[in-house]
Interface confidence: low
């Protein structure tokens, strides 16, 4: 009978050896068998499972001239860059006839310095704010003890005594380095060193101190910054969109913010060059030598209305008998708010000044008192907003109306014989 067909007689003449090494090691397992007749294909098992994608080579050497003579078959399994997943019991397997033969086992073990699965990462934290760092290592050999170091000083006096995978740091007041050391019977491996940069805390209580049409004075309370004094604070203002889309936690607004820097202390800043009667959102961050704090949430604020910056334009005043027709155009200068209307004042040479609120119309017909013989009549107009009157125009003398001159149909304004109120003429 051909050798290897009887269950009690194994064809294997060389069994896999043992490999124990550190991660990354390259090694070879080898088994040898002697069979009669056509050499079988040698399969490799790890922990009883066939390795489908094994890096194996098979060499066959005939021991005679006839193919029915004995053959020596050598199979070599190459393990490149030993990993934990490679460890286990290895055997060779062959099918000979209707029988299956398995070699004696060899063992692959991993033993070396600890290997880091997770290492502490660089990060920034606000001063005096708790955070966690993670570190994880494995052998074999086990156990693997971790020792945390802060600025190279052990946080526990020996590995395994103190925090292990997760280090809870209750807060820092200076930028520090953290690393962890993993120890096992083979020695020590040190993780990367993580730099934890201590930034100032987010400022608090951002609020308005005073408001003017084109400037806002704001103040805030600085957060702790550890051992690093604040160098400056940065304030940003952005025009609010109509939908008030800037909410706490929403992404930055699309338009370019107006940015101002404040020397500190005091923790106060006058933000100028703003539009009057305009909604803004503002936020502040403070910076130390280590970097900037996080921004505060956007705070909605609004500049107040101002008075118009210029008088109405192109004032014309014409007289026709006992009526005077006055018209004008809106001021070219910024209104600094919502135009509520116009005030008009007129005065003769020897008569008291008469002041009228015209509303939003830009023309008015005055019904003059008496026979219309008032001499040297002049008219002034001012625009006003909720904040008050803008500057008055220069006095415009009343011109006599000439036939052919256009005079629109308009509402007559009959002035009372005694003015309701009177302003001094200037």
């Amino acid at each position: 009978a051909p050798r290897g067909t009887q269950a009690e007689e194994s064809p294997f003449v060389g069994n896999p050896g043992n490999i124990t090494g550190a991660r990354g090691l390259t090694g070879t397992l080898r088994c040898q068998l002697q069979v009669q007749g056509e050499p079988p294909e040698v399969h490799w098992l790890r922990d009883g499972q066939i390795l489908e994608l094994a890096d194996s080579t098979q060499t066959q050497v005939p021991l005679g001239e006839d193919e029915q003579d004995d053959w020596i078959v050598v199979s070599q399994l190459r393990i490149t860059s030993l990993q934990l997943s490679d460890t286990g019991q290895y055997q060779c397997l062959v099918f000979l006839g209707h029988q299956t033969f398995v070699s004696q086992p060899g063992y692959v073990g991993l033993e070396g310095l600890p290997y880091f699965l997770e290492e502490p990462e660089d990060r920034t934290v606000a001063a005096n704010t708790p955070f966690n760092l993670s570190c994880q290592a494995q052998g074999p050999p086990e156990p693997v003890d971790l020792l945390w170091l802060q600025d190279a000083v052990p946080l526990a006096t020996a590995p395994g005594h103190g925090p292990q995978r997760s280090l809870h740091v209750p807060g820092l007041n200076k930028t520090s380095s953290f690393s962890c050391e993993a120890h096992n019977a083979k020695g020590v491996t040190t993780s990367r060193t993580a730099t934890i940069t201590v930034l100032p805390q987010q400022p608090r209580n951002l609020h308005l101190v005073s408001r003017q049409p084109t400037e806002l004075e704001v103040a805030w309370t600085p957060g702790l910054s550890g051992i690093y004094p604040l160098t400056h604070c940065t304030l940003q203002a952005v025009l609010s969109d109509d939908g008030m889309g800037i909410q706490a936690g929403e992404p930055d607004p699309p338009e370019e913010p107006l940015t101002s820097q404040a020397s500190v202390p005091p923790h106060q800043l006058r933000l100028g060059s703003l539009h009057p009667h305009t909604p803004y959102h503002i936020r502040v961050a403070c910076t130390s030598s280590q970097g900037p704090s996080s921004w505060t949430h956007w705070l909605p604020v609004e500049t107040p209305e101002g008075v118009p910056l210029g008088p109405p334009e192109n004032i014309s005043a014409t007289r026709n008998g006992s009526q005077a027709f006055v018209h004008w155009q809106e001021p070219r200068a910024p209104l600094q708010g919502t135009l509520l209307g116009y005030r008009l004042a007129y005065q003769g040479q020897d008569t008291p000044e008469v002041l009228m609120d015209i509303g939003l119309r830009q023309e008015v017909t005055l019904e003059l008192q008496g026979d219309g013989s008032v001499s040297n009549l002049t008219v002034c107009v001012a625009a006003y907003t909720a904040a008050g009157d803008g500057p008055w125009s220069l006095p415009v003398p009343l011109e006599a109306w000439r036939p052919g001159q256009a005079q629109p149909v308009h509402q007559l304004v009959k002035e009372p014989s005694t003015p309701a109120f009177s302003w001094p003429w200037w």
Epitope: A152, S177, T193
Partner: antibody, heavy 118, light 107 residues
Framework: DVQLQESGPDLVKPSQSLSLTCTVT?????????WHWIRQFPGNKLEWMGY???????NYNPSLKSRISITRDTSKNQFFLQLSSVTTEDTATYYC???????????WGQGTSVTVSS | DVQITQSPSYLAASPGETITIKCRAS??????LAWYQEKPGKTNKLLIY???TLHSGIPSRFSGSGSGTDFTLTISSLEPEDFAMYYC?????????FGGGTKLEIK
């Protein structure tokens, strides 16, 4: 095998600085461990002075903090002790040592005797 | 700083005997005490660390025990080469501190 060897002057005048060198062979001082200076006064009292960690950070005995400096030259695998403003009280045998990963000292130098005298 | 009191400062014994040396810390140092042997012309030798862990290459006749504040070094069946100076050192916190030493001499 790891070996540590101290070297430096035998005699230092009061108020001067004491400078000692520890040369390490068989292990890189930047690979791991902490590298220490210890001194033994006449009468056998031992005092831990400080260390330089393999990362370059230092830790000193608070009793010496204002006078001590430990530095290193990684290219020569040496670390150094400088003790300023010495007095006769600093007369001692000075040792360098390496601390084990459980933070006790597993390798010591032979020691070098330093006398402070005018 | 942690003060370490070592006793006795002097001990005479014969080869084959068992001796003990004690160290007491001024406050708890957990288990972190080391023992060293000092001999003229040789470098100091670490015997025990973390209270009871025998350093590699040290004969098993040396043993350490204790935790908290009270620690003991025991040398059983003294050999002639064991007669030397012995020191304890706490490695629980910085600054590290040493005991005053025990001189073990042949009786």
């Amino acid at each position: 095998d790891v070996q540590l060897q101290e070297s430096g002057p035998d005699l230092v005048k009061p108020s001067q600085s004491l400078s000692l060198t520890c040369t390490v062979t068989g292990y890189s001082i930047t690979s791991a461990y902490s590298w220490h200076w210890i001194r033994q006064f006449p009468g056998n009292k031992l005092e831990w002075m400080g260390y330089i960690h393999y990362s370059g950070s230092t830790n000193y005995n608070p009793s010496l903090k204002s006078r001590i400096s430990i530095t290193r030259d990684t290219s020569k695998n040496q670390f150094f002790l400088q003790l300023s403003s010495v007095t006769t009280e600093d007369t001692a045998t000075y040792y360098c040592a390496r601390s084990l990963w459980f933070y006790a000292m597993d390798y010591w130098g032979q020691g070098t005797s330093v006398t402070v005298s005018s | 700083d942690v003060q370490i009191t070592q006793s006795p400062s002097y001990l005479a014994a014969s080869p084959g005997e068992t001796i003990t040396i004690k160290c007491r810390a001024s406050k708890s140092i957990s288990k972190y005490l080391a023992w060293y042997q000092e001999k003229p012309g040789k470098t100091n030798k670490l015997l025990i660390y973390s209270g009871s862990t025998l350093h590699s290459g040290i004969p098993s006749r040396f043993s350490g025990s204790g935790s908290g504040t009270d620690f003991t070094l025991t040398i059983s069946s003294l050999e002639p080469e064991d007669f030397a100076m012995y020191y304890c050192q706490q490695h629980n916190e910085y600054p590290w501190t040493f005991g005053g030493g025990t001189k073990l001499e042949i009786k």
